[in-house]
Structure formats: structure tokens, C-alpha cells
Amino acid sequence: LVLDFNNIRSSADLHGARKGSQCLSDTDCNTRKFCLQPRDEKPFCATCRGLRRRCQRDAMCCPGTLCVNDVCTTMEDATPILERQLDEQDGTHAEGTTGHPVQENQPKRKPSIKKSQGRKGQEGESCLRTFDCGPGLCCARHFWTKICKPVLLEGQVCSRRGHKDTAQAPEIFQRCDCGPGLLCRSQLTSNRQHARLRVCQKIEKL
């Protein structure tokens, strides 16, 4: 597998992308930011635009809104128009937050065009963000899409590199976080090969 990295940057760059930092695309910017490309300057991460502000694309609008007819509009207002064909920035840094994918540079939302209004996504269905998935699921990347995946249970591997990533294809398979009452911790093991393996473990009460 080969990835074309023309439009993305390293995790370190992405993690540091805040207002004013340079970007190549919206995915380079953290949550509530988008990649603004002024005519005579280099593109930079700018704060998302609120309701009724002018926009050219969904990523320019703050979470919960999208760009309809060049204006940031609430999802409820836009749903009948777009049949939920949405594409909105949702770049929350998610480590340790139940129900979010375990990955440093969480990508933008992926649409689901035919879900009936109000119905939550099931496992394997396309999603926009975790809100669109049913209980016990989160919205996470799988290959070139985002789908609803189960939140991790006790004993399940939660390492960032839990999947067979390759040098050419890092982090194209996101995992959800550990479920409620669980933390992602290194597994105590005598086998040095698995020393870095992290699993979901119960939070010990003090």
C-alpha cells in the first residue's frame, strides 16, 4: 500500500497546529480550526466561523454547523436540504476521552447519506462523528472512510499502533478509546516483546 502524503503532515506537525500555524489542508488544523488560504500569504489555521457567518466549505464552520448556500447553518436546519451529506471538521484530540478514536490527528467527519434522521449508526456504517454512532460505538477511521466502531472493553489492546501499520500507511485504522471506567495502560508482562503493549484496564479506586 502506498499513501500520497501531499496533503498531510507528520503527527508532530498536526499536533502542534493551532491558530496561526501553517497548514496544507483542513486536516492539518486542530478542532474548531480550518485551513485559511489568503491570496497573498501562506495558508494558516484559523478559528472556525459561527452561525450565519460566510463560508466556502463545511470545514470553515464550527462543529454542529455546516456550510449551506455560503452561510454556516445548524445541522438541524441543513438536514432536509442536504440529506445529511455532511463534511465538517471534527478534529478533537481524543486520547483518554471515552468514545473517541485513539489517534493524534483525528480526521474530519465522514458522511452517511441515507441514514434516517435521528437513527444512530451501527457497527461498520459511515459516520460524521461519534455523536452519529449508537451506544458503545465511536466514529473512527478505517482505510479511506470513517465508520462506527466499538468502544474498547477491558483487556482489549488500545495501543496507538495496535493494528498492523506500515511505514507507508500509518494510522489508517483508528481504534476507539477504552470504555467507561477503563484506562489505556501498559500491560505488566515478563515477555519483553510485549512490554509496550497497552490494554484497557479498570481504574483502581484509591
Partner: antibody
Framework: EVQLVESGGGLVQPGGSLRLSCAAS????????ISWVRQAPGKGLEWVAS??????????YYPDSVKGRFTISRDNAKNSLYLQMNSLRAEDTAVYYC???????????WGQGTTVTVSS | EIVLTQSPATLSLSPGERATLSCRAS??????????INWYQQKPGQAPRLLIY???KQGSGIPARFSGSGSGTDFTLTISSLEPEDFAVYYC?????????FGGGTKVEIK
């Protein structure tokens, strides 16, 4: 209604080039991943290339069998997907389908296909 | 890469009969609590059509007579009662690992 219509197939000599197109309609094209899958005569299906939607930075993906020879690209303004095929070989002879992943992670909508024949 | 082996290569049945198609993976295609296996139907001269994804979930507009089951490495597509339009080639596909791969197909023909 979701529609994918491929074009650009034809007869080409080994070592030659061809550019396939896929015109999409019925959905917000730029938001979705879209792929090329091929099928050699009388054979099974083989994934050829994919490009993610705007939310994942339009990243491109290829199997080893075509990497360096094929290039997938998209023109979101024209709702079109392309496959530039260079250094074509006899084994690239196939029907080429474009397929998209709208409702789930699988290839849930397909075009009717366009035939590419590589022969001298 | 993950190799998918479908059996039988050909299944000869009559309308109304039950069809059971098998797909075996060279390694587990389960991850994140999901079986990343899909089933497609293809009729002569037509594009494939998604029947089942995530092992057992029906694609849009797929009749209830089509069902998928299995986990790990062994998966089954069942057509509870064959209709005349069901005679076609069926492919399984894995989308757990890169590259995505397809099985060789099972042809369901009229006996």
C-alpha cells in the same frame, strides 16, 4: 439517485498509456472516498486504487501491483474521478469499475465499468 | 496479504432451495469487534452489488433472504430460498488489512 459512469477505456499497446474517467452524481462527491476496482476477463475482482474524501485529505492508496504506474486523482469541481494508467501490460486488460463507499466502509455503489484491452 | 478462499467454486441448485456459500480467510479478519468481510453479487455483464458488509449487515435494498454469518476466518453467505434472479457469481472481500482482497468467487447456477 447515486450514479457512477466510467469512460475512457479502449485498446492500447503494451507500454502505452490510458486515462479513465468516472463521472459521479447524486451525492456530495468531494466528501466521499472513491475507488477503482478491475476484473480481468473471466476472472475475479481486484482493487486498483482509492482516494479518500475531503475529510481525510484526499489521500491516495494503491496495491503493489500498480504503484508507480497508475495514478488516481479527482476533480471535485467536476464531480469526476480519474485513473491515469502508464506502462500498461497485458495483465492490466480488464473491465475497470469505479466504486464509492457512501453508507459503510465497503464498496456500496458501482459504475457499469469500462473495458481496457492491452494488446499488440 | 490476506487470501480469501471461496467454496464451492460452483453450486448447482434449483429455485426455492437454500444456498450456503463459504469464504475462508488465511488469517482473522476480525478487528475492533467487527468482522471486516463483505459479500457481493455479480451477474453477467453487470457491476458487482454489495449484499452484506461487516460480516452480517445487509446493504441498502438487499432482500432479507440474503444473510451473512461467521467470525474470525470462516464466513458464510446464506440465501434462504433461491429466486430466479439470484443465480449469479458471489464474491467475498476483506477490508481488514491492506491491500483489500477478494475471494475467487462462487457461481450459483440453475440445476
Amino acid at each position: 439517485e447515486v450514479q457512477l459512469v466510467e469512460s475512457g477505456g479502449g485498446l492500447v499497446q503494451p507500454g502505452g498509456s490510458l486515462r479513465l474517467s468516472c463521472a459521479a452524481s447524486g451525492f456530495t462527491f468531494s466528501s466521499y472516498a472513491i475507488s477503482w476496482v478491475r476484473q480481468a476477463p473471466g476472472k475475479g475482482l481486484e482493487w486498483v486504487a482509492s482516494v479518500s474524501g475531503t475529510g481525510l485529505g484526499f489521500q491516495t492508496y494503491y496495491p503493489d501491483s500498480v504503484k508507480g504506474r497508475f495514478t488516481i486523482s479527482r476533480d471535485n469541481a467536476k464531480n469526476s474521478l480519474y485513473l491515469q494508467m502508464n506502462s500498461l501490460r497485458a495483465e492490466d486488460t480488464a473491465v475497470y469499475y469505479c466504486a464509492t463507499s457512501l453508507e459503510n466502509y465497503a464498496f456500496d455503489y458501482w459504475g457499469q465499468g469500462t473495458t481496457v484491452t492491452v494488446s499488440s | 496479504e490476506i487470501v480469501l478462499t471461496q467454496s464451492p467454486a460452483t453450486l448447482s441448485l434449483s429455485p426455492g432451495e437454500r444456498a450456503t456459500l463459504s469464504c475462508r480467510a488465511s488469517e482473522s479478519v476480525d478487528d475492533f469487534g467487527i468482522s471486516f468481510i463483505n459479500w457481493y453479487q455479480q451477474k453477467p455483464g453487470q457491476a458487482p452489488r454489495l449484499l452484506i458488509y461487516a460480516g452480517s449487515k445487509q446493504g441498502s435494498g438487499i432482500p432479507a433472504r440474503f444473510s451473512g454469518s461467521g467470525s474470525g476466518t470462516d464466513f458464510t453467505l446464506t440465501i434462504s430460498s433461491l429466486e430466479p434472479e439470484d443465480f449469479a457469481v458471489y464474491y467475498c472481500q476483506q477490508l481488514k488489512e491492506v491491500p483489500p482482497t477478494f475471494g475467487g468467487g462462487t457461481k450459483v447456477e440453475i440445476k
